[in-house]
């Protein structure tokens, strides 16, 4: 006997209670593929979530985060509170980046300043909580009469960069 359910298109389900008739998905549910025996419940965007795309009979709702929050996880499964630039979100809330680290975004963690000396360069602009250091030419490049063929100065030990 042919399975009549395979003929049911997306947006419907195969109703076994009605001799395998294709019935439309009930309100607030959907089926994104044909041949489904049930429809899935639509995702609800509530609390810190807001609706980016309404649920239809053939596709689930899609959520974004409300202002002041950003998405985490696949399909925005979580919303995380923003912090200010120069901060990171910890177990105790938004905290300023420690000295020597920075965060130029409203999300994520504070990252260490670039150690210019590891590349044989000098610090052109000091780092802040919000911005990384800007590395400039190597000290040797700045000496009078230096040519472009001058090899880079030997890298100093980490922790001794002029920051």
């Amino acid at each position: 006997l042919q399975d009549l359910c395979s003929n049911c298109p997306a947006g419907t389900f195969c109703d076994n209670n009605r001799s395998q008739i294709c019935s439309p998905c009930p309100p607030n549910s959907f089926s994104s593929a044909g041949g489904q025996r049930t429809c899935d419940i639509c995702r609800q965007c509530k609390g810190v979530f807001k609706t980016r795309k309404e649920c239809s009979s053939t596709s689930n709702a899609e959520c974004d985060c409300i202002s002041g929050y950003h998405c985490l996880g696949a399909e925005c499964s979580m919303c995380e509170q923003d912090c200010k630039q120069g901060q990171e979100l910890t177990k105790k809330g938004c905290k300023d980046c420690c000295f020597g680290t920075f965060n130029d975004q409203k999300r994520g963690i504070c990252r260490p300043w670039t150690n210019c000396s590891l590349d044989g360069k000098s610090v052109l602009v000091n780092g802040t909580k919000e911005r990384d250091v800007v590395c400039g030419p190597s000290p040797a490049d700045l000496s009078p009469g230096a040519s472009s063929a001058t090899p880079p100065a030997p890298a100093r030990e980490p922790g001794h960069s002029p920051q």
Epitope: R43, K46, C63, L72, S77, Q81, L89, C94
Partner: nanobody
């Protein structure tokens, strides 16, 4: 069906106190972390406080030492005791489940109450 029903809001003078309650039903309350959030007029939603199933508590900096979150598993209720209230505490306060256990983070499976209004004014 999961339900969260907040109560206890109202008008209070600066320096005064209020205790908010959130009665929960439709899920295993005793093993669920719970949280409070608030939304001041014209502002965004702010994470206020959270409590793990084991009782560990967390607060946002602005309410620390003034607000206390607690729970009574026998009554399926979470509380927010608010002391030394300030005009800037005026907001709609929401109770929510807190499945992520992470400060300032909620997941799509978390449930939310309808909120209760707290007004701090002289």
């Amino acid at each position: 069906e999961v339900q969260l029903l907040e109560s206890g809001g109202g008008l209070v003078q600066p320096g005064g106190s209020l205790r908010l309650s959130c009665a929960a039903s439709g899920f295993t309350f005793s093993s669920s972390a719970m949280s409070w959030a608030r939304q001041a007029p014209g502002k965004g939603l702010e994470w206020v406080s959270g409590i793990y199933s084991g009782g560990s508590t967390y607060y946002t900096e602005s309410v620390k030492d003034r607000f206390t979150i607690s729970r009574d598993n026998s009554k399926n209720t979470v509380y927010l005791q608010m002391n030394s209230l300030k005009p800037e505490d005026t907001a709609v306060y929401y109770c929510a489940t807190w499945g992520t256990l992470r400060f300032g983070v909620w997941a799509e499976y978390d449930h939310w109450g309808q909120g209760t209004l707290v007004t701090v004014s002289s």
